[in-house]
């Protein structure tokens, strides 16, 4: 169990002087309004900070913004507002940072009402210089970079025009009118929904999904009667209005819309929704909302085609009103996901899956913890972790659960121990094995971040009072030491560290409590002298992931293989370093029936691992449709779980069945698909896709 804060952990000696020498204060010489921070590039140390200040006047709001740049991870900042001609920047568009290490930045300016178009400031040298460009349109959305080529930009106008630039925003061309939603696909493809009647908001379900592969020279309508569309991994999804026009069904394409399959998922009515919770090139987690304002639905996991789905979790919490779900991919361990269910008694309970949604179980409570008042049995309860739903309902939860791919097995989360999520003040819990076991690491709510690939965890208490203390741990949250980073406490607003958890620097943002004017201030602390030496081979130990029974030959097998990692010893206080690469040794497992999904037309009876044929397909909600026509489907009843690498062992062979089912979707068939050249009728409107804080791939 965790010794707690400042008990004799014996981890880091003389740390106060070391940290004091590496603590850098910067007071921003402007009034406290709002602040946004962006990292430009990876491992460049370049940070851009935009402060904006709105003065509420009776008739209008007067605003001013300042732009600051750091090239040493936030230790020093230079006011570069003059590079953007002291222009007021629109914060709702943020700073559009180019992909990878392109060094590109686009800032969208606030312009006066009568102007012909908007204005942007562009930089392609990591914000050392900016070029002002007047736009021939008023942007509705932030500029979208092509993932393949950062010179190619996409934007929607307030008039619902789709505009493309091929020279990093220097020149713009309107390639289509009446566009509701646009997204970059693979290889420079652009997908968008358009309504030739002109309205986006009123005619959802009557949109056309179009594609251009040549930046607007030609178009192909790949689907009609579209409600919405989304991209996830290799999959293109469209929710399509069915025959009666009141129900929608999901269609999936893996070839950019050339051909479509109808997903074997229940159709939904107008008050329901679909949401892709997670997707990669192998599979999809899809949430299907229950009818009525239930606040929950069912999670389905797909096969590798994205068409056949297995029921993964029922009563999955996903609010209809705010669109909150607690679904989280634990990135520090393969196959691990957590989320919440809405129990019959309306309590919210946390569950975890260690096998990519195959099975969901409660989280094991820390060994030494007592069950709280929500527990019926004071000895038997589980850990419940707070995520988006708790934050949305106003609980004292400052952060979502946190994990990083390069900090293997490490998970930090707010939680409580009982029968359900508690409304009481939460504590911070840490797992070092991907969610199998947990310790209570910190009392009360905190902000937290991971540095040096898990070598250091930094936390700051969540308080309404000004603060001046940070806590840090060099042993994955077991022991904590405190450091007073300033004599004068500040109102804390955020903790910033370079994305990717490889940095040794942490920036504490806040504003001063002042007799004069409250100002933005940042304190950047470099932990390089705490972890004085580079880690060596002796500092690492072998760890088998997903190990629950060392006696079992199959111990650690998840999705057909097990992985051994080299993990930093908790007692080692050393630097993993910026170039640290996770060392893992995979080994293939023998196949069992658990490595297979039931194919279309088959299901698993409860407590049985065998797939049996559905006795009667007719009348089921689930439809299966290949290419929009009646098809023969041949199946042996089993299909390997996407990403499963097992070999040998059980190889389920069943006689081949011929399943015949008429497709009832009025989805546009490929033979009806038509190409057309640029240009279409005018109109306006807007359609917003919802993207969740925890990167929900698509919510229709």
């Amino acid at each position: 169990s965790a010794p707690g804060e400042d008990e004799e952990c014996g981890r880091v000696r003389d740390f106060v002087a070391k940290l004091a020498n590496n603590t850098h204060q910067h007071v921003f010489d402007d009034l406290r309004g709002s602040v946004s921070l962006s990292w430009v590039g990876d491992s460049t140390g370049v940070i851009l900070v935009l402060t904006t200040f709105h003065v509420p006047l009776v008739i209008m709001t007067f605003g001013q913004s300042k732009l600051y740049r750091s090239e040493d991870y936030g230790k020093n900042f230079k006011d570069i507002t003059d590079l953007i001609n002291n222009t007021f920047i629109r914060t709702e568009f943020g700073m559009a940072i180019g992909p990878e290490n392109s060094g590109k930045v686009v800032l969208t300016a606030e312009v006066s009402g009568g102007s012909r178009g908007g204005r942007i400031f562009r930089s392609s040298d990591f914000a050392k210089n900016f070029v002002q460009t007047d736009l021939p349109f008023h942007p509705l959305t932030q500029m979208m970079y092509s993932p393949q080529n950062s010179d190619y930009l996409l934007a929607l106008s307030t008039e619902n025009g789709l505009w493309v630039s091929k020279n990093f925003g220097g020149k713009w061309e309107e390639i289509h009118k009446t566009v509701c939603l646009a997204k970059w696909g693979r290889k420079g493809t652009i997908f968008f929904t358009a309504n030739h009647n002109g309205s986006c908001s009123n005619d959802r379900g009557m949109l056309e999904l179009e594609r251009t592969t040549d930046y607007g020279k030609s178009f192909k309508t790949v689907a009609s009667k579209i409600y919405s569309f989304g991209l996830g991994g290799k999959f293109l999804f469209a929710s399509v209005m069915t025959g009666k026009g009141t129900l929608r069904a999901i269609h999936v394409s893996v070839d950019d819309g050339d051909t479509w399959n109808m997903a074997q998922l229940p159709p939904v009515g107008h008050e329901q929704f679909y949401s892709i919770l997670a997707a990669n090139d192998e599979m999809v987690f899809m949430h299907v909302d229950e009818p009525g304002d239930s606040g929950f639905g069912t999670i389905y996991v797909s096969d590798d085609r994205g068409t056949v789905y297995s029921k993964s979790l029922e009563r999955h919490l996903y609010t209809t009103t705010g669109g909150e779900t607690d679904f989280i991919n634990v990135t520090s361990l393969r196959g691990v996901f957590t989320t919440s269910i809405l129990a019959e008694d309306k309590s919210v309970q946390s569950v975890i899956s260690f096998d990519q949604g195959g099975e969901w179980v409660p989280l094991r409570k820390p060994a030494d913890s007592k069950c709280d008042a929500t527990a019926r049995d004071p000895e038997k309860c589980s850990l419940h972790i707070h995520a988006a739903y708790s934050i949305a309902t106003g609980l004292n939860v400052p952060m979502l659960p946190l994990s990083e791919p390069n900090a293997v097995g490490l998970v930090l989360a707010h939680g409580s121990v009982g029968d359900a999520i508690s409304v009481m003040r939460p504590d911070v819990y840490v797992s070092d094995d991907g969610g199998y076991t947990w310790i209570k690491a910190l009392e009360g709510p905190h902000y937290y971040t991971i540095l040096d690939s898990g070598g250091i965890i930094v936390a700051i208490e969540h308080s309404s009072r000004p603060i001046n203390v940070i806590k840090f741990s060099t042993d994955e949250g077991q022991c904590w030491q405190t450091y007073t980073f300033t004599r004068d406490p500040i109102y804390f607003t955020g903790l910033a560290s370079e994305p990717g958890a490889r940095s040794m620097n942490i920036s504490i943002w806040g504003f001063t409590e002042s007799f004069l004017t409250s100002q933005w201030v940042s304190y950047t602390i470099d932990f390089k002298d705490i972890l004085e030496r580079n880690c060596e081979e002796k500092d690492y130990t072998i760890w088998l992931a997903h190990s629950t029974d060392p006696e079992d030959y199959e111990d650690g097998c998840i999705l057909g293989y097990k992985e051994q990692f080299l993990r930093l010893r908790k007692s080692s206080v050393c630097q993993n370093g910026r170039d640290y690469v996770v060392t893992k040794q995979p080994s293939i497992c023998l196949c069992s029936l658990e490595d297979f999904l039931c194919d279309f037309g088959y299901y698993r009876p409860e407590n049985d691992s065998k797939c049996v044929e559905q006795p009667e397909l007719k009348g089921h909600d689930l439809e299966f449709c290949l290419y929009g026509r009646e098809e023969h489907l041949t199946t042996n009843g089993y299909r390997k779980i996407p990403g499963d690498k097992c070999q040998g062992g059980v190889n389920p062979v069943r006689e081949v069945k011929d399943l015949k089912k008429k497709c009832t979707s009025n989805f546009l068939s490929p033979e009806k698909q038509n190409s057309k050249s640029n240009g279409s009728a005018g109109g306006s409107g807007g359609l917003n896709d919802i993207f969740e804080a925890q990167k929900i791939e698509w919510h229709e």
């Epitope: 009034l31 709105h54 509420p56 000004p466 001063t512 409590e513 002042s514 007799f515 004017t517 409250s518």
Partner: antibody, heavy 117, light 112 residues
Framework: EVHLVESGGDLVNPGGSLKLSCEAS????????MSWVRQTPDKRLEWVAM????????QYPDSVKGRFTISRDNAKNTLYLQMSGLKSEDTGTYHC??????????WGQGTLVTVSA | DVVMTQTPLTLSVTIGQPASISCKSS???????????LNWLLQRPGQSPKRLIY???KLDSGVPDRFTGSGSGTDFTLRISRVEAEDLGVYYC?????????FGAGTKLELK
């Protein structure tokens, strides 16, 4: 435009209490430190109390320490001065002032406090 | 407490002519942060005081550039290059470097 409007001034007996209010508008109240300054009948200006932007810190001159309490409600954009144990030398016009990079950047029109038997 | 001494107490001027007011503090007003918290205020007849100059020499917005502030340490001066009718009233200096904050007794600028 910055607007500060004081209220609550009155005629009060020595030893009595009074609470002054100052309603602020035209700026983001929670960002700025605030003060009360009084002007005595002989036109001298005297700083009376000061409060920091978030209301955490306060300062007073010895002449009012222990008798006056400055406070603020940032949600209501209002500054207060609670006065007790009032003396005749506390008589004057009490002005609410807003600070910026220095002190007393903006002044309200004032509210008259008279301490007399 | 820091005593602020203003001279003269009354200054009779002619419209269009220059004017100068002195303010001396009993201690240096240079703060540890490098700033000098010395303000000049003007109170026109029947009005509240209004700040003209802060941090020795910085003009508040809307203040005409005929006003200039100068000085350092303990000696400070407010100059008006050409007095106009709207400049008449009582001028106060005040310091904000040391607690308690203190004001000068005021200088009345009046017409000759």
């Amino acid at each position: 435009e910055v607007h500060l409007v004081e209220s609550g001034g009155d005629l009060v007996n020595p030893g009595g209490s009074l609470k002054l209010s100052c309603e602020a508008s035209g700026f983001i109240f929670s960002i700025y430190g605030m003060s009360w300054v009084r002007q005595t009948p002989d036109k001298r200006l005297e700083w009376v109390a000061m409060i920091s932007s978030g209301g955490i810190y306060t300062q007073y001159p010895d002449s009012v320490k222990g008798r006056f309490t400055i406070s603020r409600d940032n949600a209501k954009n209002t500054l207060y001065l609670q006065m007790s144990g009032l003396k005749s030398e506390d008589t004057g016009t009490y002005h609410c002032t807003r600070h910026d990079d220095s002190w007393f950047a903006y002044w309200g029109q004032g509210t008259l406090v008279t301490v007399s038997a | 407490d820091v005593v602020m001494t203003q001279t003269p107490l009354t200054l009779s001027v002619t419209i269009g002519q220059p004017a100068s007011i002195s303010c001396k503090s009993s201690q240096s007003l240079l703060d540890s942060n490098g700033k000098t918290y010395l303000n000049w205020l003007l109170q026109r007849p029947g009005q509240s005081p209004k700040r003209l100059i802060y941090l020795v020499s910085k003009l508040d917005s809307g203040v005409p550039d005929r006003f200039t502030g100068s000085g350092s340490g303990t000696d400070f001066t407010l100059r008006i290059s050409r007095v106009e009718a709207e400049d008449l009233g009582v001028y106060y200096c005040c310091q904000g470097t040391h607690f308690p904050l203190t004001f000068g007794a005021g200088t009345k600028l009046e017409l000759k």
